[in-house]
């Protein structure tokens, strides 16, 4: 039987990683996972990843969605796998924008 797991530091979660900051990895490990969507030069840029240090995500995750950026955060292994951040446009798309996944 595996022994007890004392909490000597904050819990870490496995997160899906998609985007330029991920390098060759498709996952990362951190204290929070995130899924984000931003508009860059008319493109919808989707990214996923993790905040390794809780404070990194504290402000980002509390920022309400704006027409140009939305971030959703979660805590749990692979919790950002099925999360797609949505811009607050109630189903309308911005003219001249297209979807783009940063790989």
């Amino acid at each position: 039987m595996e022994d007890e797991k004392p909490k000597v530091n904050p819990k870490l979660y496995m997160c899906v990683c998609e985007g330029l900051s991920c390098g060759n990895e498709d996952h990362c490990e951190g204290q929070q996972c995130f899924s984000s969507l931003s508009i860059n030069d008319g493109f919808h840029v989707y990214q996923k990843g993790c905040f390794q240090v809780y404070e990194q995500g504290k402000m980002t995750c509390k920022t309400p969605p704006s027409p140009g950026q939305a971030v959703e955060c979660c805590q749990g292994d692979w919790c950002n796998r099925n999360i797609t951040a949505q811009l607050p446009t109630k189903g309308k798309s911005f003219p001249g924008t297209q979807n783009f996944h940063l790989e």
Epitope: K5, P6, N9, E25
Partner: antibody, heavy 114, light 113 residues
Framework: QVQLVESGGGLVKPGGSLRLSCAAS????????MSWIRQAPGKGLEWVSY????????YYADSVKGRFTISRDNAKNSLNLQMSSLRAEDTAVYFC???????WGQGTLVTVSS | KIVLTQTPLSSPVTLGQPASISCRSS???????????LSWLHQRPGQPPRLLIY???NRLSGVPDRFSGSGAGTDFTLKISRVEAEDVGVYYC??????????FGGGTKVEIK
């Protein structure tokens, strides 16, 4: 039972390199993050480096950043620390430790001296 | 970077008598998740450290109840109610709040008078 056995320590000249290994057994290695922690002779403990369960995330103390590289091979249940540009102040016993620091190896001594 | 300062550096005690070690942090160790990641470790001569207590006051299974941890924020204490011969060695406090940058106190040597 959980076992961690370090190896690779020894005497090396300043500027030289050394590769430490830690062989793990008695638990599912890939389920745990691992750390290297060192202790200079007669001194206290200093955290050196950390690697996540899959090896995708690595962290280093400022004192070793750019000189040390941590890696792991989950298929072989092994943890490694590649040390280069070694300095006299890197002289220490190097311990590998398993999350959450309740299991430590006996340590391997690294001496950097000309 | 969080700095942990331990006092005293050395604590000579009589067998059966209590001992107390203090650990002061340069900043609060309360994490955003509400927990305080302050642990205590014990190292006997020639051996690796052994984790005794985590999140201020939780004893690891197998650790005798003569060991107790207390404190909050930046000030923490490890108490041994009745020191036994096997308790000699160096005690370290450690913070994990700023993980992965773990930091340790300088250590307190407990020896028998």
């Amino acid at each position: 039972q959980v076992q961690l056995v370090e190896s690779g320590g020894g005497l090396v000249k300043p500027g030289g390199s050394l590769r430490l290994s830690c062989a793990a057994s008695g638990f599912t290695f890939s389920d745990y993050y691992m750390s290297w922690i060192r202790q200079a002779p007669g001194k206290g403990l200093e955290w050196v480096s950390y690697i996540s369960r899959t090896g995708s995330t690595k962290y280093y103390a400022d004192s070793v950043k750019g000189r040390f590289t941590i890696s792991r091979d989950n298929a072989k249940n092994s943890l490694n620390l590649q040390m280069s540009s070694l300095r006299a102040e890197d002289t220490a016993v190097y311990f590998c430790a398993r999350e959450p620091l309740q299991h430590w190896g006996q340590g391997t001594l690294v001496t950097v001296s000309s | 970077k969080i700095v942990l300062t331990q006092t005293p550096l050395s604590s000579p005690v009589t067998l059966g008598q209590p001992a107390s070690i203090s650990c002061r942090s340069s900043q609060s160790l309360v994490h955003s998740d509400g927990d305080t990641y302050l642990s205590w470790l014990h190292q006997r001569p020639g051996q690796p450290p052994r984790l005794l207590i985590y999140t201020i006051s939780n004893r690891l299974s197998g650790v005798p109840d003569r060991f107790s941890g207390s404190g909050a924020g930046t000030d923490f204490t490890l108490k041994i109610s009745r020191v036994e011969a096997e308790d000699v060695g160096v005690y370290y406090c450690m913070q994990g709040t700023q993980f992965p940058a773990l930091t340790f106190g300088g250590g307190t040597k407990v020896e028998i008078k």
